[in-house]
């Protein structure tokens, strides 16, 4: 009897009610390996889940998360909400980044602004909740009499007005 069942291919099940005949999986079910005695119910992607791959007789459906959420867990078993840039996801929802930190992604945590002075540089552009600071030349480079590190501006192409 076992040998008869082992002949049943993926997409079928070994039907004990019909003398070990290989029967096709019913609608909305699948078997991904041969020799199965039952077919598994297809996963349904609904609510915050959307279908990435339809279920077939030999493979389960695959889900993704709808816009505004991202997958977590094995095979996208959970959908976690996105936050806006300048926020981080906490256990109690999306919270704005504290002063001195930023997040330029829709997920992850707020990170401290770069400390330009650690590299002997100055702050060229201030940081925001969404963006890190931009470090510029060291303060010494900007002191009067220091040679300019800026190359001369290239000649404008004819027909182009200045920006």
């Amino acid at each position: 009897l076992q040998d008869l069942c082992s002949n049943c291919p993926a997409g079928t099940f070994c039907d004990n009610n019909r003398s070990q005949i290989c029967s096709p999986c019913p609608p909305n079910s699948f078997s991904s390996a041969g020799g199965q005695r039952t077919c598994d119910i297809c996963r349904q992607c609904k609510g915050v889940f959307k279908t990435r791959k339809e279920c077939s007789s030999t493979s389960n459906a695959e889900c993704d998360c709808i816009s505004g959420y991202h997958c977590l867990g094995a095979e996208c078993s959970m959908c976690e909400q996105d936050c806006k840039q300048g926020q981080e996801l906490t256990k109690k929802g999306c919270k704005d980044c504290c002063f001195g930190t930023f997040n330029d992604q829709k997920r992850g945590i707020c990170r401290p602004w770069t400390n330009c002075s650690l590299d002997g540089k100055s702050v060229l552009v201030n940081g925001t909740k969404e963006r890190d600071v931009v470090c510029g030349p060291s303060p010494a480079d900007l002191s009067p009499g220091a040679s300019s590190a800026t190359p001369p501006a290239p000649a404008r192409e004819p027909g182009h007005s200045p920006q």
């Epitope: 996801l89 906490t90 256990k91 945590i109």
Partner: nanobody
């Protein structure tokens, strides 16, 4: 291999009670904080409760405070969630999760391993 296996879910009447369990293996259970989260059918993941590795500190979402109790038995490598006065909005798949450190709180998610989930349905 680190594994978390939830059990205890099922169909329960409005106002009823359920106790979820999460059996842990593959790591030193008492060294890590643990968390319960849930996902309702039409919603994203919602944090429910967290407990420190020692069990001394517990934290709850406002929506379950006073109704749910998180606990752990480190000798049995098991996490629990006692759910009382259940409401329709508690219907969800409940997941237990291992945090990366022994301490926890009600701010950051710090989770690195998730269970497969157990379904709780509250019917009226």
């Amino acid at each position: 291999e680190v594994q978390l296996l939830e059990s205890g879910g099922g169909l329960v009447q409005l106002g009823g009670s359920l106790r979820l369990s999460c059996a842990a293996s593959g790591f030193t259970f008492s060294s890590y904080a643990m968390t319960w989260v849930r996902q309702a059918p039409e919603k994203g993941l919602e944090w429910v409760s967290s407990i420190s590795g020692s069990g001394g500190n517990t934290y709850y979402a406002d929506s379950v405070k006073g109704r749910f109790t998180i606990s752990r038995d480190n000798s049995k490598n098991t996490l629990y969630l006692q759910m009382n006065s259940l409401r329709a909005e508690d219907t969800a798949v409940y997941y237990c999760a291992k945090e990366r450190t022994g301490t926890t709180g009600d701010y950051y998610y710090n989770v690195d391993v998730w269970g497969q989930g157990t379904t709780v349905t509250v019917s009226s």
